[in-house]
């Protein structure tokens, strides 16, 4: 059975509008229905209608369709405002250009290429023919309008009123020639509704066949009308989701306007010495970020790969390595020539109006009041007022509503890692924004004025299973499997969540991974009774530069004698130097006949300064790192141990204080190991666990 196509994409929608007929002779047909889609299907097929349907109105209050043989351009009709009405006009009847060969063209051009008036289709004078409206139903052979009922090569044509010229093509342009855009088409508001390969675009207000976040009501300024090509997210050119279930989206073939002029409203005020607004019009030659690090050239991919190239962002003046703001960021910025610092803001450029805008944040950004409204992964922020319920769920005080305006990045919950926002994407409820800390800002992001040294352990009783303290158990240890082989360690911190390292995920296909819990042997030998094998359903990447990942399990682990969770430390806590800790892993042991059993190496905590000395001053540790040296020379984490934990004990409580990440050498004698400091990221971990949905057991 042929699947009925959804034809609403063939209509232009005018919200809160209806048509009133002034000419009483005009017919109308009405019927009760549930959705506008049903109206559209009937209009397109003309099923049960005594006329050719050109438009319809959907009455949302009465759940009723009104089908019309006319549209807003017809005589004897006027448009009227009406809250409960939505007008849908078949695009074929209002389009003044053709797609492909123009088979679907139903416009009102009635003059040929050389200027001869067309002969009416129902007439046999001056030329007899077989193209009768009754023989070509649905081809709209009305009046003397140009048509292409057989889809012939030259496009729409007609028999002419000149007896000497039997027929001639009409000069109707291709829609792709009529439509043009400036720059990368962010301001394009034209009527192109199909992709460069000819696929019909999906309506922005529909979620089938592709679910998406670009809802017209959420982004009223993006021009998400009907199913027209748009560029809401800074792509190289306009695009749309397609009606092909196998092709999520595609670019549209819209040429660049000949004179490349922009509307006055689109042109940012150009400045060379200072920043106006967010500095999108800054065209000066400053080429270092705030702390003096030189900028990378925009046309270079070294040391940082990116897509902010002059080719992709025309009109943004991405010359040389000058600070620019091509993407609507907080202020001009650039990629840096330091391989360890991807981007930086050029916040040393003065504001033309000193009271306007903010380029960066101080401390943890809780007082940041700039107007960036995009996450680091490019998702558009959703309005704060739509998310207050969620916000109240994870903070225990009343947020300052005066700061939470629009959908700007803010930090209402005192997050240590800077401003963030909600996204409206159910899989990624919130994320951080790409904003740097201000020049010379030394405010610590962890502020603990009441307690200069916070204990890492939470004051609670040690849990006991079957009368044996769980401290003898390593049930929180996870073997992350990649294509059936152990690749990394991890720590079970909650039934559905594993803390591990970013580098442990070489493939983007989550089907390539499994988590093994409750095992002692890396191959699971002898662990059959206690082993739990769980699939991975999502990866949540940690704050920028953290190298952490929270891995969500497809179903919660069952806690028993062999599988348990490990505690997290208090946020911002300090563990005393010389505290004895352990690293666990199934990684490289240096032994030829490795038995595959879980190994432990005993380390002790070392202060950051002392640690730096042991690394001959080549490494400077920051507040997000923790250092631990080996009691036994040459023991410590290595390949296969990455993602695993540094476990320490305080007040008889075991906690994961560090995560093993690549890049710090492999159990090098006299070189202490440097780990990601979990205490620094503890609030982020709690926030993810609290805000991300997990499957119920």
């Amino acid at each position: 059975q042929r699947k009925r196509r959804n034809t609403i994409h063939e209509f232009k929608k005018s919200a809160k509008t209806t048509l009133i007929k002034i000419d009483p002779a005009l017919k109308i047909k009405t019927k009760k229905v549930n959705t506008a889609d049903q109206c559209a299907n009937r209009c397109t097929r003309n099923k049960g209608l005594p006329f050719t349907c050109k438009a319809f109105v959907f009455d949302k209050a009465r759940k009723q369709c009104l089908w019309f043989p006319f549209n807003s351009m017809s005589s004897g009709v006027k448009k009227e405002f009406g809250h409960e009405f939505d007008l849908y006009e078949n695009k074929d009847y209002i389009r003044n250009c053709i797609i492909g060969k123009g088979r679907s063209y139903k416009g009102t051009v009635s003059i040929t290429k050389s200027g001869i008036k067309c002969q009416p289709w129902s007439s046999m004078i001056p030329h007899e023919h077989s193209f009768l409206p009754s023989s070509y139903r649905g081809k709209d052979l009305q009046e003397n309008y140009c048509r292409n009922p057989r889809g012939e090569e030259g496009g729409p044509w007609c028999f002419t009123s000149n007896p000497e010229v039997r027929y001639e093509v009409c000069d109707i342009p291709q829609c792709s020639e009529v439509e043009c855009m400036t720059c990368n088409g962010e301001s394009y508001r034209g009527l192109m509704d199909h992709t460069e390969s000819g696929k019909i675009c999906q309506r922005w207000d529909h979620q089938t066949p592709h679910r998406h976040k670009f809802l017209p009501e959420r982004y009223p300024d993006k021009g998400f009308d009907d199913n027209y090509c748009r560029n809401p997210d800074g792509q190289p050119r306009p695009w749309c989701y397609t009606l092909d279930p196998h092709t999520r989206w595609e670019y549209c073939a819209i040429k660049t306007c000949a004179d490349n002029t922009m509307n006055d409203t689109d042109v940012p005020l150009e400045t060379t010495e200072c920043i106006q607004g967010q500095g999108e019009g800054y065209r000066g030659t400053v080429n270092t970020i705030w702390n003096g690090i030189p900028c990378q050239r925009w046309d270079s991919q070294y040391p940082h790969e990116h897509d902010m190239t002059p080719e992709n962002f025309k009109c943004k003046d991405l010359r040389e390595n000058y600070c620019r703001n091509p993407d609507g960021s907080e202020s001009p910025w650039c990629f840096t020539t330091d391989p360890n610092i991807r981007v930086g803001y050029c916040s040393q450029i003065p504001n033309c109006d000193m009271s306007h805008g903010q380029d960066c944040y101080r401390g943890n950004g809780k007082n940041y009041m700039g107007n960036l409204s995009q996450t680091r992964s490019g998702l558009t922020c959703s309005m704060w007022d739509k998310n207050m319920e969620d916000l109240h769920r994870h903070i225990f005080w009343e947020p300052d509503a005066s700061k939470l305006n629009e959908n700007y990045c803010r930090n209402p919950d005192d997050d240590a890692h800077g401003p963030w926002c909600y996204t409206g994407n159910p899989l990624i409820p919130w994320d951080y924004c790409p904003i740097s800390r201000c020049e010379g800002d030394t405010t610590p992001t962890i502020v603990n004025l009441d307690h200069p040294v916070i204990s890492c352990a939470k004051t609670k009783q040690l849990r006991v299973v079957n009368g044996i303290p769980t401290r003898t158990n390593i049930g929180w240890m996870v073997s992350l499997r990649y294509r059936n082989k152990h690749i990394c360690g991890g720590s079970l911190i909650k039934e559905s969540w594993v803390l591990t390292a970013r580098q442990c995920f070489p493939s983007r296909d989550l089907k390539d991974y499994e988590a093994w819990l409750g095992i002692h042997d890396v191959h699971g030998r002898g662990d059959e009774k206690c082993k739990q094998v769980l699939n991975v359903s999502q990866l949540v990447y940690g704050p920028e530069g953290s190298d952490l990942v929270l891995m969500k399990l497809a179903r919660p682990a069952v806690l028993d004698d062999f599988v348990s969770t490990i505690d997290l430390p208090n946020y911002g806590c300090t563990i005393p130097e010389k505290t004895s800790c352990s690293v666990y892993g199934w990684g490289y042991t240096g032994l030829i006949n490795y038995d595959g059993l879980l190994r432990v190496a005993h380390l002790y905590i070392m202060g950051n300064e002392k640690c730096s000395q042991h690394h001959r001053g080549k490494v400077t540790l920051n507040e997000s790192e923790i250092c631990a040296g080996a009691e036994k020379i040459g023991s410590g984490p290595c390949e296969g141990d990455y993602g695993g934990p540094l476990v320490c004990e305080q007040h008889k409580m075991r906690m994961v204080l560090g995560v093993i990440v690549p890049g710090r050498g492999c159990a090098i004698p006299n070189r202490p190991g440097i780990f990601v400091r979990v205490a620094y990221y503890a609030k982020w971990i709690h926030k993810i666990i609290l805000t991300y949905k997990v499957p119920q057991s």
Epitope: Y251, P506, S507, Y588
Partner: antibody
Framework: EVQLVESGGGLVQPGGSLRLSCAAS????????ISWVRQAPGKGLEWVAV???????DYASSAKGRFTISRDNSKNTLYLQMNSLRAEDTAVYYC?????????????WGQGTLVTVSS | DYQMTQSPSTLSASVGDRVTITCQVS??????LSWYQQKPGKAPKLLIY???TLASGVPSRFSGSGSGTEFTLTISSLQPDDFATYYC????????????FGGGTKVEIK
Amino acid sequence: EVQLVESGGGLVQPGGSLRLSCAASGFTVSSNAISWVRQAPGKGLEWVAVIYVVGATDYASSAKGRFTISRDNSKNTLYLQMNSLRAEDTAVYYCARVYDSGWNHFNLWGQGTLVTVSS
Amino acid sequence: DYQMTQSPSTLSASVGDRVTITCQVSQSISSWLSWYQQKPGKAPKLLIYRASTLASGVPSRFSGSGSGTEFTLTISSLQPDDFATYYCQQAYSVSNVDNAFGGGTKVEIK
């Protein structure tokens, strides 16, 4: 200068072994995934093997069980140990740097080394 | 398994022509696709990654599009320097993969 230089190619008999080397300069081999890609005379590119930042490896079905990819961080060098060589392994072998720590696109290539398997 | 099918295998064109090469993947890879250009006796050169992002120093006449399973490389106006072989490569996963590259498209002078 950031570059990759392959060596170790040559003529080898069917069933024989060969070890290719790829010396990196300007970056460390342990900070990126690195791959071997080969091209038989007059044929297209064929991916052979990859070693990721965490040390895990992947192989194309044609290389599985016969080839081993490894690296020596102290020498900043990548290797491909090829055993049980067949005539169809004759190709130019390129070593290529993968962007970031996992599977991705290749943003730096060596000049290639020719391996000929023939009796 | 991600099978890569590139078409056509050979394409004859003239300078100034608009050239389109397609790459089909047996299952969805989102936008994780790259395009390379290779000239005889040389190593391949990265042209486009993430389906549509131009690599550094690549002329703007090259463009990439598509997502999911269908991808296209377009050269808007073929130049003498563009006669070469072009390959697509999936950058999604190498799980049970025979080859991460497409079979190649040779663009030759008409």
